[in-house]
Amino acid sequence: RKIPKVGHTFFQKPESCPPVPGGSMKLDIGIINENQRVSMSRNIESRSTSPWNYTVTWDPNRYPSEVVQAQCRNLGCINAQGKEDISMNSVPIQQETLVVRRKHQGCSVSFQLEKVLVTVGCTCVTPVIHHVQ
Amino acid sequence: GITIPRNPGCPNSEDKNFPRTVMVNLNIHNRNTNTNPKRSSDYYNRSTSPWNLHRNEDPERYPSVIWEAKCRHLGCINADGNVDYHMNSVPIQQEILVLRREPPHCPNSFRLEKILVSVGCTCVTPIVHHVA
């Protein structure tokens, strides 16, 4: 799917828009809000009843090159006694983000936007029970 | 910027880092993944730290619709279906990259923007601070 060109009069192309070759778009990768920091509660990944670990994936042909992925530590959830309760399930929570992919075709380079699914953390859910007929 | 490995036979004039501005193909790779979390899973209702999903819409951004999670309770749902305040529901937040039209209203000119979204909620043991 292409990025929508919104058709409202609100989106009449202003004179100040830069010229762009057909089939492509101009993308400034100097990130707005680059220095904002996540203010999540302290070490929730360890305090959660569905704890998780983080791993960093690295790809030099991707911008940003570093993407952090979470993995649930358990199949079940941790109960009040600190034991795994397999009557409940730890499940991953995922979120899409955009990255810029750099592609080498011979000596020429092209850039492609890509949607990446990131696992952000885990939550504890009641399982869906499927009964056999 | 990021250092990129180059074909050794290519001219040396190519910049090893990502340039500040790039021309990008309008088609997005992996674009067909489901962007509506209500349709992709029902974890938001089945979780012991359930959440509501609020639609955040901005036509100057791509994607224009982002779903924000808000924890339904301060406590967590226990085995009896009651809200137990011995545990706390907290949002799981994630920085994501989106496209911001720049200059505003331009159809094919964007800048990357980092935004913080609450994706869902998880149940945690609270940190208790007693008064001395």
Epitope: - | H73, P91, P126, H130
Partner: antibody, heavy 121, light 112 residues
């Protein structure tokens, strides 16, 4: 206009039971949490229980074994079933709406006028 | 249970003068999500309580701007910049961070 009207109070003997009602109008009970709060004569406020928009509940553990909160969405009415009543349960009982829906403040923004429960032999 | 302690319990004030009520909780009211669920209510004579301030410092709709709330953690304050005759009643602090939700014992504001 948001309105909460309590009823069902009265004189009851120790050990007896009573069911209080709170009729809500101007909003839907399946969109907001609603609390019961009581006030003994000449005393301060004491929180009793809440039923949240999704039907889950939270109780004051000191009262949970004797009091049960429930609601009927079709009547948009909240209930408090009180059993094994004691003299110390004598109070004005208020229902109060929680701000929770979409706002997530967890405060009580609209209160009923209260219904008086007297437990005496 | 969280104990909420208000002071003073009685507050005689001259109209037009400022007033201040303190409330201290026995435990921090900061939730794991970083927010503080501390509120102020006013119960006017013969009436039901009404919400004045929610989440420490936010005035509820229709509440005059002479009322302000502040504080953090365990110590909170309600200030009235210029008391008016209609402000008389009992002021209660409250917390909904921890269950059971609790109220302070109340501060009775009266006009001198």
């Amino acid at each position: 206009e948001v309105q909460l009207v309590e009823s069902g109070g009265g004189l009851v003997q120790p050990g007896g039971s009573l069911r209080l009602s709170c009729a809500a109008s101007g909003f839907s009970l399946d969109s907001y949490g609603v609390h019961w709060v009581r006030q003994a004569p000449g005393k301060g406020l004491e929180w009793v229980s809440v039923i949240w928009s999704d039907g889950t509940t939270t109780y004051n553990s000191a009262l949970k074994s004797r009091f049960t909160i429930s609601r009927d969405n079709s009547k948009n009415t909240l209930y408090l079933q009180m059993n094994s009543l004691r003299a110390e349960d004598t109070a004005v009982y208020y229902c109060a709406r929680d701000t929770h829906y979409r706002l997530y403040y967890y405060a009580m923004d609209y209160w009923g006028q209260g219904t008086t429960v007297t437990v005496s032999s | 249970d969280i104990v909420m302690t208000q002071s003073p319990l009685s507050l005689p004030v001259t109209p037009g003068e400022p007033a201040s009520i303190s409330c201290r909780s026995s435990q921090s009211l900061v939730h794991s999500n970083g927010d503080t669920y501390f509120h102020w209510y006013l119960q006017k004579p013969g009436q039901s309580p009404q919400l004045l301030i929610y989440k420490v410092s936010n005035r509820f709709s229709g509440v005059p701007d002479r009322f302000s709330g502040s504080g953090s953690g365990t110590d909170f304050t309600l200030k009235i910049s210029r008391v008016e005759a209609e402000d008389v009643g009992v002021y209660y602090c409250s917390q909904t961070t921890h269950a059971p939700f609790t109220f302070g014992q109340g501060t009775k504001l009266e006009i001198k």
